[in-house]
């Protein structure tokens, strides 16, 4: 019985739970998901039972062995998977545990602007990047393009300080999770700060 294997899948995609068995005379293999039986295989009996009908179209054995492939993944497929290999040649079953995390493909992140001020010809504000549907395990980074050196900033909030007369800058939020990444629409510093340009001491949301 090896250490827990961590697997990652994407909604609509597929994942294979790898199983290499050295057991010679296998009586049965039982795959379970969160303690619910998923598949039972009795190799010599020629028996393959997929416990729930809704999984019959999603289960496969891809490598000519006992590895399990689960396709058309859904968010609620995330959880603990467990396989037991039972054999009269073993005093106790050979087991392996897996943890599956299923993530959604990220949609375009949304950017909101915080309170904006324009003092002494410098536009100061915060840009906040977020996912509209509250997806899990999202990491945000910002790319600032247009100055001598392109810059990166980690985190969902980007503090901006842009002086009128400087070359224009473009800000892009990059949202990442373990299965995908997506980009916000580019935001131009000049456009962003135009609202505060008329009044050098104004602040706006």
């Amino acid at each position: 019985s090896g250490p827990v294997k961590e697997l990652v899948g994407s909604v609509g995609g597929a994942v294979t739970f790898p199983l290499k068995s050295k057991v010679k005379q296998v009586d049965s293999i039982v795959w379970t998901f969160n303690t619910t039986p998923l598949v039972t295989i009795q190799p010599e009996g020629g028996t393959i039972i997929v416990t729930q009908n809704r999984n019959r179209e999603r289960v496969d054995f891809p490598d000519g062995g006992y590895s399990l492939k689960l396709s058309k993944l859904k968010k609620n497929d995330s959880g603990i998977y467990y396989v037991g290999i039972y054999s009269s040649s073993l005093q106790q079953p050979s087991t392996q545990e897996y943890v599956l995390h299923v993530y959604e493909h990220l949609s375009k992140p949304k950017v909101t602007m915080g309170l904006q001020s324009n003092k002494n010809g410098t536009c100061v504000t915060n840009l906040t990047c977020c996912m509209e549907h509250g997806e899990e395990d999202v990491i945000y980074t910002w790319k600032a393009l247009g100055q001598a050196a392109n810059e990166s900033h980690n985190g969902s909030i980007l503090p901006i300080s842009w002086r009128w007369g400087e070359s224009d800058m473009t800000f892009i939020c990059v949202a990442r999770n373990p299965v995908s990444r997506n980009f916000s629409s580019p935001i131009l510093a000049r456009k962003l700060c135009e609202g505060a340009a008329d009044d050098p001491d104004s602040s706006m949301v």
Partner: antibody, heavy 117, light 107 residues
């Protein structure tokens, strides 16, 4: 070389019993499973029962409760005890070695069982 | 319910023809499928095991493949000795199951 020979077939009345034998040589029953398959006259092949290498037994639903598969590893023989026989059990009965990977590689020539009054 | 659906039930072909026989499983059975040739009055003979592995002593014109739950036996160039009935055998929820058989006859 692996060899498989069936015996014990014959004519039996409906409701009667018969025991078929499958004598194997060239391999050990502790290492390989043995399957029984039958073929009614002019029909296709039908799975009947299998005994695994560790002695586990499995049956087709059509014979479950009426047929019993067993083995004697010292005599290298697999048996199929058939009780409550019906006319539809009339067939040539084959036994074969389970090679693994769903393959049955050594077959006997078959023994004919006729259930008739 | 039929666990393995074999098609066609019969076909006529000539020597040298390419012949394809298909077996469809009612659910995924991985590679737990084999193919057999049977001649009248004889025992079945193993051709392919594990869906695509050629059995010992079987000519290379026989091959097996799998696509999802569809399994195919192909005879690349039919020979006179290949006229016979072919069966698939596979795993199922109820244990081993045979296809209905395909009789390959001379055209």
């Amino acid at each position: 070389e692996q060899q498989v020979v069936e015996s014990g077939g014959g004519l039996v009345q409906p409701g009667g019993s018969l025991r078929l034998s499958c004598a194997v040589s060239g391999f050990s029953l502790n290492s390989y499973g043995v399957i029984w398959v039958r073929q009614a006259p002019g029909k296709g092949l039908e799975y009947v029962s299998i005994i695994g290498s560790s002695g586990n037994t499995y049956y087709a639903s059509s014979v479950k409760g009426r047929f019993t598969i067993s083995r004697d590893t010292r005599l290298n023989t697999v048996y199929l005890q058939m009780n409550s026989l019906r006319a539809e059990d009339t067939a040539v009965y084959f036994c074969a070695r389970y090679y693994g990977d769903s393959g049955f590689d050594s077959w006997g020539q078959g023994t004919l069982v006729t259930v008739s009054s | 319910d039929q666990q393995l659906t074999q098609s066609p039930s019969s076909l006529s072909a000539s020597v040298g023809d390419r012949v394809t026989i298909t077996c469809r499983a009612s659910q995924s059975i991985g590679s737990w499928l084999s193919w057999y040739q049977q001649k009248p009055g004889k025992a079945p003979k193993l051709l392919i095991y594990g869906a695509s592995n050629l059995a010992s002593g079987v000519p290379s014109r026989f091959s097996g493949s799998r696509s999802g739950t569809d399994y195919t036996l192909t005879i690349s160039s039919l020979q006179p000795e290949d006229f016979a009935t072919y069966y698939c055998l596979g795993a199922s929820p109820n244990g081993w199951a045979f296809g209905q058989g395909t009789k390959v006859e001379i055209k």
